[in-house]
């Protein structure tokens, strides 16, 4: 572990209460194929424990969704991944809108520091799928 | 190679016969920019030869496709990547529907074991593009 | 650095003049969360300085875009990532069309050689967003 191979792959646990757009994540072999090796969860949010450049990736699929759901009927649905704490480092890292699709997936390289907590904010009126092959979120340390 | 840097990037060879939703892959420098360094192909399916956590990624583009093709005219098209053998480890790792798009692309971290064979199942009534910059599938060992 | 951990994450600087479909990139801590560690920029295009297999990833979001923008009103919008020089190695590595969406995101593994310059060509009549969480392009050396 001293090599700094910090890595995590999380599955969706639940959405937040009414005014909280955050997705709450969980991980661990008992839950399926999710895991945390280095990073940790703090009330469902992912906290980084080692400085470095990370590959952050996410896929979110909307539940009971058709292309008409995301286009006409509903409020625009957007997913943003960002550092939400500490407040001094708050920033949006990755943002996608669903438009006429029901799934977004992306990835990016970004510097993260020990103590950074990543939040994934889903705005809109559709629920994310909890299927582990449809919605997941992960980070991988790639270099100092 | 003892570092465990197993890696592969594959291009589409062909689709399966009528009742077989699997995509059949090929790789090697003679074919273009695809390669296998560690993992191997078994009848067009990717077999893992080293335990570890892997980054699995895929992009599939549908042939002669327009947004109307995938939404209204045609049967819903879905791509699923999973472990298909050994049967005891069979599971879906990654699933995406095309909805009103003609391309899906995603990636995820997942633990894989020596002998796991990955299958990519494309259901629907549209063909995948065989262009090597539009359809590809790869894995990268990232840590034990 | 001798480990060969070449890595870069770039943000959009500007689009090219009328007949030039290339996107021009910039990177560096002073600009935000973009960086170049090994690869370098040559007139806004990314040049590789170390042979190896790289993970190339990109996300491009179209500015002031709705799903109707990309489908009905406008010329088909496509993003292609390729080696544009040296001419002898010119090839398209990754290609995506926007169809009814406003964002494309993908990634792939590909062998790159010292001196390869990567170009990202955006064809169509819509501008890419310059927001750093919506449009970015990066490479990561993963093995020799």
């Amino acid at each position: 572990e001293s090599l700094g191979w910090d890595i995590a792959e999380l599955q969706l646990n639940h959405t937040g209460p009414q005014q909280d757009p955050r997705l709450y994540w969980q991980g661990g072999p008992a839950l399926g194929r999710s895991f945390l090796r280095g990073p940790e969860l703090d009330k469902g949010q992912l906290r980084i424990r080692r400085d470095g450049i990370y590959m952050v990736h996410i896929q979110v699929t909307l539940a009971i969704c058709s292309s008409t759901s995301t286009s006409r009927h509903h409020h625009p649905t957007t997913l943003a991944v960002g550092i939400c704490s500490p407040a001094s480092r708050s920033i949006s890292l990755l943002r996608l809108s669903f438009h006429q699709g029901c799934t977004i997936a992306s990835q990016r390289l970004t510097p993260l520091a020990r103590g950074d907590t990543l939040c994934t904010n889903l705005t809109g009126t559709l629920l994310p799928s909890r299927n582990t092959d449809e919605t997941f979120f992960g980070v991988q340390w790639v270099r100092p | 190679e003892s570092l465990g840097w197993d890696i592969a990037e594959l291009q589409l060879n062909h689709t399966g016969p009528q009742q077989d939703p699997r995509l059949y892959w090929q790789g090697g420098p003679a074919l273009g920019r695809s390669f296998l360094r560690g993992p191997e192909l078994d009848k067009g399916q990717l077999r893992i030869r080293r335990d570890g956590i892997y980054m699995v990624h895929i992009q599939v583009t549908l042939a002669i496709c327009s947004s109307t093709s995938t939404s209204r005219h045609h049967h819903p098209t879905t791509l699923a990547v999973g472990i298909c053998s050994p049967a005891s480890r069979s599971i879906s790792l990654l699933r995406l529907s095309f909805h009103q798009g003609c391309t899906i692309a995603s990636q995820r971290l997942t633990p894989l074991a020596r002998g796991d064979t990955l299958c990519t199942n494309l259901t629907g009534t549209l063909l995948p593009s065989r262009n090597t910059d539009e359809t590809f599938f790869g894995v990268q060992w990232v840590r034990p | 650095e001798s480990l060969g951990w070449d890595i870069a994450e770039l943000q959009l600087n500007h689009t090219g003049p009328q007949q030039d479909p290339r996107l021009y990139w910039q990177g560096g801590p002073a600009l935000g969360r973009s960086f170049l560690r090994g690869p370098e920029l040559d007139k806004g295009q990314l040049r590789i300085r170390r042979d190896g297999i790289y993970m190339v990833h990109i996300q491009v979001t179209l500015a002031i875009c709705s799903s109707t923008s990309t489908s009905r009103h406008h010329h088909p919008t496509t993003l292609a990532v390729g080696i544009c020089s040296p001419a002898s190695r010119s090839i398209s590595l990754l290609r995506l069309s926007f169809h009814q969406g406003c964002t494309i995101a993908s990634q792939r593994l590909t062998p790159l050689a010292r001196g390869d310059t990567l170009c990202t060509n955006l064809t169509g009549t819509l501008l890419p967003s310059r927001n750093t969480d919506e449009t970015f392009f990066g490479v990561q050396w993963v093995r020799p």
Epitope: - | Q18, R72, H73, H74, H75, T125, L126, L127, T135 | -
Partner: antibody, heavy 119, light 111 residues
Amino acid sequence: QVQLKQSGPGLVQPSQSLSITCTVSDFSLTIFGVHWVRQSPGKGLEWLGVIWRDGSTDYNAALMSRLNITKDNSKSQVFFKMNSLQTDDTAIYYCAKNRRYDYAWFPYWGQGTLVSVSA
Amino acid sequence: DIVLTQSPASLAVSLGQRATISCRASKSVSASGYSFLHWYQQKPGQPPKLLIYLTSNLESGVPARFSGSGSGTDFTLNIHPVEEEDAATYYCQHSRDFPPTFGAGTKLELK
């Protein structure tokens, strides 16, 4: 196995309309599209149109104003209607479909309906 | 519309010999790594029978003496060795875009 069976009149008066029914078995019209093709000595094989799984249609532009293709999924029937027939519409009319995909190549054909346009 | 030109219009081949039929498209019928060109055989009183799809894929149940090749705009159907039951008219067809179109046909007779 997959079958397409056609029924319809053999003789049509000029300026009248033609109606043919294609009844399909062993596949669902909610999954696959059904195409129509005709064959005449003068024009050879000519693609006429298609009805997709959702009921939307594409027609040969040269004939679009005269064609109407509809279906009844529950009865597994596709209905082909062509208006204002003239003598050069005399042909064998076929319904056809692909085996697995929605591209226009055709392993499966109806038996054909010979249509003569004559006073 | 894409025009498909078949040649020859007819040919006579001896049993066991090779028959070669050409089909030329007015513009490319290739896309997405495929050539959307197909071949049919038709005998009198029957609908066309699909032999080959996507240039070179043999339809189920079609004998291996039938083969197809080509790309872009130029395509070939080969029959070797020709057998008695192969006497028929052969058509090429594209499905690159709408409308799909057919060639005018090549009539194969046995010497």
